[in-house]
């Protein structure tokens, strides 16, 4: 099933997030992703766990998954590079870089997003945008068009409370509020954007969605700048 869900959000303005990617398996949306360079999309490592023999592709320039749009184009994947320390049973190091078969054709609806290189936490209370094509309610309705939600960043101490994520949130992870509005495992790999800068990637660990005591977990890209640079080089 698609790993994707924006709960309690609303439809995004069409093509206002030109960095947004749909990672697809056998022609169906699987995960979110974010264009970070002309030929590279950043996503979550767990997204490809079940991909095995399937065909992985990346859709760029899309708002609707099904409708024809002039900016839409599906790219084959030349190389998939999961973070070397990612493991199936943990949310740590949940990053994946996908090299497209060719450089993306850039334009108003397809453009890489600057990503944070300064390794410091986003200040709690900052409102950040998360977007995706995942299911939009607990009944499992899947949207055709891109959804988004603006969520406040939560401080790590709160997120690590015993009643919340009980110490699982390392310095390489960050949290955002999940009170009825949330990202969920289906939006894995999608971007958390704060003030026009990519700060986090939705992790794909399984957790309850929309419960304020189980905040959304995001991998901090700044903490992986050296790895990202080394792969893109």
């Amino acid at each position: 099933p698609p790993r994707g869900r924006i709960l309690g959000g609303r439809e995004a303005e069409a093509h206002a997030r030109p960095y947004m990617a749909s990672v697809q398996l056998n022609g169906a949306h699987l995960c979110g992703g974010v264009l970070v360079a002309e030929q590279w999309v950043l996503s979550a490592a767990h997204c490809l766990e079940d991909a095995a023999d399937g065909k992985v592709q990346v859709l760029l320039g899309a708002h609707s998954l099904s409708q024809p749009e002039p900016s839409k184009r599906l790219y084959d994947v030349l190389r998939a590079v999961p973070h070397p320390d990612s493991q199936p049973d943990t949310i740590d190091h949940d990053l994946l870089l996908l090299q497209l078969s060719e450089k993306a054709t850039l334009g108003p609806a397809v453009r890489p997003l600057p990503w944070q290189r300064v390794d410091r936490d986003v200040a709690p209370g900052t409102l950040c945008d998360v977007a995706g094509w995942g299911i939009v309610n607990h009944a499992g309705r899947r949207p055709d068009s891109l959804q988004h939600v603006l969520l406040p960043v939560l401080d790590r101490a709160t997120c690590n409370r015993r009643t919340h994520h009980d110490g699982a949130i390392t310095e390489r992870l960050m949290c955002a509020e999940s009170n009825r509005r949330d990202s969920c495992k289906g939006d894995s790999g999608g971007p958390l954007v704060c003030g026009g800068v990519l700060e986090g990637v939705v992790t794909s660990g399984s957790r309850v969605c929309g419960n304020r005591k189980k905040p959304g977990i995001y991998t901090r890209v700044a903490s992986y700048a050296a790895w990202i640079d080394s792969v893109l080089a």
Partner: antibody, heavy 122, light 107 residues
Framework: QVQLQQSGPELVKPGASVKISCKAS????????INWVKQRPGQGLEWIGW????????YYNEKFKGKATLTVDKSSSTAYMLLSSLPSEDSAVYFC???????????????WGQGTSVTVSS | DIQMTQSPASLSVSVGETVTITCRAS??????LAWYQQKQGKSPQLLVY???NLADGVPSRFSGSGSGTQYSLKINSLQSEDFGSYYC?????????FGGGTKLEIK
């Protein structure tokens, strides 16, 4: 068109509480954060906190925790701010303001209420 | 908390002149900055968002610029309706503090 209509001026005694309102119209109330801002006479602007009407989530300036309580009534598209244990220095104009969204992740206070004057005096 | 230092605190200028108001953040705010105009006895009005973008209906004589910690609002060819107070506000973290304001007066 978008409008935020605030309740009228209040004269309250020191130590008392006051609840002021901000009625929204012209947009989907539950989709936008509502902020509250304080302005003392002849002074600058001070952010108190926000509430997201869709979920009731709140976030406060540390300085106003315990002083201000933000709530909403979705059925009437109205946001409220309760100010408690008022000393004279809480005499000010209080504004509500909506966060508008721009692009993917920028925001700013795009619509403001006309302000509610609160005077604390015995 | 991030501090926003706005200067000058007041400015006396004539109609037709050009003025620049500056705002310095105590740390990088990544262009997460807005400018507002407030007339006496009225509520503030949004002029600029994301440091450089004019809000709907704002005349083109207004312009915002800057990045990192340094930002400015420029008003070309001042009109009589431009007099009042101006405030910057950051949105990088909480609380989203305002600058102290700049009072623009007619000379």
């Amino acid at each position: 068109q978008v409008q935020l209509q605030q309740s009228g001026p209040e004269l309250v005694k020191p130590g008392a509480s006051v609840k002021i309102s901000c009625k929204a119209s012209g947009y989907t109330f539950t989709d936008y954060y509502i902020n509250w801002v304080k302005q003392r006479p002849g002074q600058g602007l001070e952010w108190i906190g926000w509430i997201f009407p869709g979920s009731g989530s709140t976030y406060y300036n540390e300085k106003f925790k315990g002083k201000a309580t933000l709530t909403v009534d979705k059925s009437s598209s109205t946001a409220y701010m309760l100010l408690s244990s008022l000393p004279s220095e809480d005499s000010a104009v209080y504004f509500c303001a909506r966060y508008g969204y721009y692009g993917s992740s920028f925001y700013a206070m795009d619509y403001w209420g006309q302000g509610t004057s609160v005077t604390v005096s015995s | 908390d991030i501090q926003m230092t706005q200067s000058p605190a007041s400015l006396s200028v004539s109609v037709g002149e050009t003025v620049t108001i500056t705002c310095r953040a105590s740390e990088n705010i990544y262009s997460n900055l807005a400018w507002y105009q407030q007339k006496q006895g009225k509520s503030p009005q949004l002029l600029v968002y994301a440091a450089t973008n004019l809000a709907d209906g704002v005349p083109s004589r207004f312009s915002g610029s800057g990045s990192g910690t340094q930002y400015s609002l420029k008003i070309n060819s001042l009109q009589s309706e431009d007099f009042g107070s101006y405030y910057c506000q950051h949105f990088w973290g909480s609380p989203p503090t305002f600058g102290g304001g700049t009072k623009l007066e007619i000379k």
